[in-house]
């Protein structure tokens, strides 16, 4: 009997409001045994995969996707999905990334009080 897969969670470090040119890391979490984490844009056809999975806790695994230099094109909704054989999970809730222009005051990142500490990962070929 196939197990019911919990929905993944998604968060962003240092937050969801990022100054233009700064970095952001998306953190996807799921159960132990996830083989592939996928970070999706609004359209499911635009995504980034990783199998570089590590322990978030004794019962959770996580993957991180980093954008080094955020542009306006990176703004928008993101969500996670994962593959744990033999099936894919449901998608996480959407997380909206907002990009602040250089003329605007930097955000106080009020969205990020629950974000875990960064390990400095970097997403490749991300959008």
């Amino acid at each position: 009997q196939e197990e019911d897969l919990p929905r993944p969670s998604i968060s962003a470090e240092p937050g969801t409001v990022i100054p233009l040119g700064s970095h952001v890391t998306f953190v996807c979490r799921g159960p132990v045994g996830v083989q592939t984490f996928r970070l999706e844009r609004e359209s499911r056809s635009t995504y980034n995969d990783t199998e570089d999975v590590s322990q978030a806790s004794p019962s959770e695994s996580e993957a991180r996707f980093r954008i080094d230099s955020v542009s306006e094109g990176n703004a928008g909704p993101y969500r996670c999905i994962y593959y744990k054989p033999p099936k894919w999970s449901e998608q996480s809730d959407y997380l909206e990334l907002l990009v602040k222009g250089p003329t605007q005051r930097p955000s106080d990142n009020s969205h990020n009080e629950h974000a875990p500490a960064s390990q400095g990962l970097k997403a490749e070929h991300l959008y």
């Epitope: 132990v32 199998e51 999975v53 322990q55 806790s57 695994s61 993957a63 980093r66």
Partner: antibody, heavy 119, light 107 residues
Framework: EVQLVETGGGLVQPKGSLKLSCAAS????????MNWVRQAPGKGLEWVAR??????????FYADSVKDRFTISRDDSQSMLYLQMNNLKTDDTAMYYC??????????WGQGTPVTVSA | DIQMTQSPASQSASLGESVTITCLAS??????LGWYRQKPGKSPQLLIY???SLADGVPSRFSGSGSGTKFSFKISSLQAEDFVIYYC?????????FGSGTKLEIK
């Protein structure tokens, strides 16, 4: 088909150096963490080193027994994994395996390359 | 460091029998545990990951159970090729430590 082919092993004197290489094919190398594991003759398995992906700033981790002597590195453009071994000791004599991570577990192993440290 | 205590060190059994190997972690590792087998002169092969999940292509006579600190690995209906060495490994924290191995011998 996933393939991991280790090369570079051989006979080296104590305090000498050796560089092991692992050529990877059959999978998307740059999305996987990679490891080196060794096995001394007639003994059990010992994890040696781990390197994560560009997503993780290529973070590296080492067993205490090799820290400050061994360096793990990777070249994603060539799908290559390396282990630079300096100041070798007789205790480093072992078969060295290149191992691909999947789901955080050691899913695929190379055939190994033997390293003998002896005067 | 997390120590992995694997037992027994060796076990004799007959074809068609079942055997169970246990692994105890010195601290909780959730289900961050793998089981491997190694045939003579060959590389290790992943059999079970995440304590209970069967790796690709592994026969269903192999199974794993447990979480936290106590784990079991069972082979039901032993076949000739099963009489080799088995290792557990924790992947919860570095250094990633292996058990000392269990040699399965034919009775």
């Amino acid at each position: 088909e996933v393939q991991l082919v280790e090369t570079g092993g051989g006979l080296v004197q104590p305090k000498g150096s050796l560089k092991l290489s692992c050529a990877a094919s059959g999978f998307t190398f740059n999305i996987n963490a990679m490891n080196w594991v060794r096995q001394a003759p007639g003994k059990g398995l010992e994890w040696v080193a781990r390197i994560r992906t560009k997503n993780n700033n290529y973070a590296t981790f080492y067993a205490d027994s090799v820290k400050d002597r061994f360096t793990i590195s990777r070249d994603d453009s060539q799908s290559m994994l390396y282990l630079q071994m300096n100041n070798l000791k007789t205790d480093d004599t072992a078969m060295y395996y290149c191992v691909r991570d999947r789901a955080g577990f050691f899913a695929y192993w190379g055939q190994g390359t033997p390293v003998t440290v002896s005067a | 460091d997390i120590q992995m205590t694997q037992s027994p060190a060796s076990q004799s059994a007959s074809l068609g029998e079942s055997v169970t190997i246990t692994c105890l972690a010195s601290q909780t590792i959730g289900t961050w545990l793998g089981w491997y087998r190694q045939k003579p002169g060959k590389s290790p092969q992943l059999l079970i990951y995440a304590a209970t999940s069967l790796a690709d292509g592994v026969p269903s006579r192999f199974s794993g159970s447990g979480s936290g600190t106590k784990f079991s690995f069972k082979i039901s209906s032993l076949q000739a090729e099963d009489f080799v060495i088995y290792y557990c490994q924790q992947l919860y924290s570095t250094p990633l430590t292996f058990g000392s191995g269990t040699k399965l011998e034919i009775k």
